[in-house]
Amino acid sequence: KLLQVSTIAMQQQEKLIQQERALLNFTEWKRSCALQMKYCQAFMQNSLSSAHNSSPCPNNWIQNRESCYYVSEIWSIWHTSQENCLKEGSTLLQIESKEEMDFITGSLRKIKGSYDYWVGLSQDGHSGRWLWQDGSSPSPGLLPAERSQSANQVCGYVKSNSLLSSNCSTWKYFICEKYALRSSV
């Protein structure tokens, strides 16, 4: 009789352990679901807010026609400037026309005054040709005014109304450019 009771007690204890395990699994599953829901909601929220917030340019960027520009508040060497722009889904500024150059220099005058700003222009070490980052050549009126006396790689920068050249390893502010979003209205 005693043996029978202890067997039943053991079975009950085993059942209890199984139920506790199941409850633990369920709690874990519920927590995981809640986390996933939170994650989904946050993702949806971000997507919705960026959809509602569909101004042509991100905050702190300046718009001119089809482009958005970001004027950095930090100094960096040319290569790091390039990477900083890529993080934002943009590239270093590529000046296509005199109108764009005038807009940039006018904006810089208003924002910061006469500082140096890296743009996406560099000089090929072998040929000495100036090229934009996508491999295209600048128009004749948009070539750096002075040839840098540097044995190192030479890159282009904007200062006041001019496009100039300097050793790419010097520290300057930089300007990023991306396309403005088209309004869907």
């Epitope: 890529l86 980052q133 996508d134």
Partner: nanobody, 115 residues
Framework: QVQLQESGGGLAQPGGSLQLSCAAS????????MGWYRQASGKQRELVAA???????TLADSVKGRFTISSDNTKNTVFLQMNSLKPEDTAVYYC?????????GGQGTQVTVSS
């Protein structure tokens, strides 16, 4: 966390071609830019090419006119088409993704240009 899967490295003759591809995967992220760095033994890592989600392109001076970069935004995949290869292009090529979750790098794929 974003995982990057590179493929297409190998051995090529000088003047030959290779295409590298890299696919980014992971939980809910969006890619701002994707690109390729390379590192030859004993040299510094350099950015070879990158493309933004809008299709804006950045190329190193040493590869302009020879390499092209393209992407398939729907699949978070980037391709590096390398033509007119030179021995000095020999390096380990690393895929890189600048995403809303941060910046991620791949394991690298070896490219050797030799006759």
């Amino acid at each position: 966390q974003v995982q990057l899967q590179e493929s297409g490295g190998g051995l090529a003759q000088p003047g030959g071609s290779l295409q590298l591809s890299c696919a980014a995967s992971g939980r809910a992220f969006s890619t701002n830019s994707m690109g390729w760095y390379r590192q030859a033994s004993g040299k510094q890592r350099e950015l070879v090419a990158a493309i933004t989600s809008q299709g804006r392109i950045t190329l190193a001076d040493s590869v302009k006119g020879r390499f092209t970069i393209s992407s398939d935004n729907t699949k978070n995949t980037v391709f590096l088409q390398m033509n007119s290869l030179k021995p000095e292009d020999t390096a380990v090529y690393y895929c890189n993704a600048w995403t809303t979750l941060g910046t991620f790098g791949g394991q690298g794929t070896q490219v050797t240009v030799s006759s």
